[in-house]
């Protein structure tokens, strides 16, 4: 039986909206796999722990990823 899309990918709808890095609790990047054919980026917001799926192709999201990785590299010894 072909695997249902419900369990293939976590993200059903994807947001192109910019996200303020300061409002982020967590950012998960799930690589493409045998189950889901695309990269998924899931942002967990500090406010209410709301989860939001972000568009990996969006310029705003690419900038966000850069900002987050810069922040991480600053923190690491």
């Amino acid at each position: 039986v072909p695997l249902s899309r419900t369990v293939r990918c976590t993200c059903i709808s994807i947001s192109n909206q910019p996200v303020n890095p300061r409002s982020l609790e967590k950012l998960e990047i799930i690589p493409a796999s045998q189950f889901c054919p695309r990269v998924e980026i899931i942002a967990t917001m500090k406010k209410k722990g709301e989860k939001r799926c972000l568009n990996p192709e969006s310029k705003a999201i690419k900038n966000l990823l850069k900002a987050v990785s810069k922040e991480r590299s600053k923190r690491s010894p």
Partner: antibody, heavy 115, light 106 residues
């Protein structure tokens, strides 16, 4: 080769429960979801639910959520479906199937609910 | 829950002929539809998935098409072994089978 083995038939009393088995072989059991399907005599196919053998995550058809319980035993590569409070409406052939690309189906278990 | 309305429920056709079965979904299923052949006493057999992709080993006499809510499945050059019941299956949101189409040969 990939095989899903199911017992041929089960005769059960009304009100009782039955636990159907589906033994997988020829592939990595925990890598693919297992799906259960019902077919009543002369009727079409109905999706009951699915289980991920790696972590026992389940999804059910709302129509079966109080009727069927899906479980797995990883050590024996066997999926199970327990059907409770059986009535004549539950008399049917029950199939298991996996989500491998070269998908496999069991031969089906005929459940007869009769006093 | 997504409903799948399959038609016709039965049809009769001649050897060498062509038949078409349709399935209409209650909402857009984004081409996540498969077609199965089911014969008595056996498990169903996957013929087509993702609307039009043939499962390996399935002859090209079997074809599928469609988008949005409307999908169709055809068999050309009908052969005696095509006698079976055919089902559509949506897998966009969990799973729903169509009601089935029983194919008989005239």
């Amino acid at each position: 080769q990939v095989q899903l083995q199911q017992p041929g038939a089960e005769l059960v009393r009304p009100g009782a429960s039955v636990k159907l088995s589906c033994k997988a072989s020829g592939y990595t059991f925990t890598s693919h979801w297992m799906i259960w399907v019902k077919q009543r005599p002369g009727q079409g196919l109905e999706w009951i639910g699915m289980i991920d053998p790696s972590d026992s995550a389940t999804h059910y058809n709302q129509m079966f959520k109080d009727k069927a319980t899906l479980t797995v035993d990883k050590s024996s590569s066997t999926a199970y479906m327990q059907l409770s409070s059986l009535t004549s409406e539950d008399s049917a052939v029950y199939y298991c199937a996996n989500t491998r690309h070269d998908e496999s189906w069991g031969q089906g278990t005929l459940v007869t609910v009769s006093a | 829950d997504i409903q799948m309305t399959q038609s016709p429920s039965s049809l009769s056709a001649s050897l060498g002929g062509r038949v078409t079965i349709t399935c209409k979904a209650s909402q857009d299923i984004h081409k996540y539809i498969a077609w199965y052949q089911h014969k008595p006493g056996k498990g169903p057999r996957l013929l087509i998935y993702d609307t039009s992709t043939l499962q390996p080993g399935i002859p090209s006499r079997f074809t599928g098409s469609g988008s949005g809510r409307d999908y169709s499945f055809s068999i050309s050059n009908l052969e005696p072994e095509d006698i079976a019941t055919y089902y559509c299956l949506q897998y966009d949101d969990l799973y729903t089978f169509g009601g089935g189409t029983k194919l008989e040969i005239k």
